[in-house]
Amino acid sequence: ITQQDLAPQQRVAPQQKRSSPSEGLCPPGHHISEDGRDCISCKYGQDYSTHWNDLLFCLRCTRCDSGEVELSPCTTTRNTVCQCEEGTFREEDSPEMCRKCRTGCPRGMVKVGDCTPWSDIECVHKESGTKHSGEAPAVEETVTSSPGTPASPCS
């Protein structure tokens, strides 16, 4: 749907341009007006919508927390993309936190995967090759690799 500006005397703020809904839905980057007659644009850098919708309000842009880096900014059609800083990762089980990667594997295990923003280091038993997951081992048990950075809460 092409966005059409209203007549100058009716025009709203630049970030609030209006168009008409198509079959009751507004395009990405917009939300629907209270009376359902208009599509109102989201505010760049503040909120967004990603799909055709009948939402009364655009969604708030995520703000990257300390301990995260911003990979891409929020636009009217896409949320901010944040990533854990080097040496930390975000688990599926606790997506609100960037956790510190382990610095090494327990005794009798060997590292087969590095710390990434999405996963801790991966350790396997030397003999069996089976994976190990769990808490960071005690210092005296570790075979050190690259050091991690402190974890910070993530939004």
Epitope: S49, F57, R60, T62, S155
Partner: nanobody
Amino acid sequence: EVQLVESGGGLVQAGGSLRLSCAASGRTFSNYAMGWFRQAPGKEREFVAALNWSGGSTYYVDSVKGRFTISRDNAKNTVYLQMNSLKPEDTAVYYCAAAGSFSLGGRPYGDDYWGKGTLVTVSS
């Protein structure tokens, strides 16, 4: 995760006023749109009012326009519903809800959280 607790309900005479509060726990309160819904005895739950994450945009169902006002204080993690010129037909349990947004029909979008409700009774 957000926990919501409503308060401020009670018995009031027609024409009177009440102010409902909804206190939220959780540091992400300001990320959510907030809504008030109500359910009268034997009836479906009804969308009453909502406002966006900043408080800058509001929505009201026609039956409460000009009488009810929704507002929020992000510093206090609280959303309010000021109800004036109450009518017997406003009698219901009032629920507070948090979601990414709400559809025109009141359907929550994204993760949604609900309080247990507070009873408002308007006598004639």
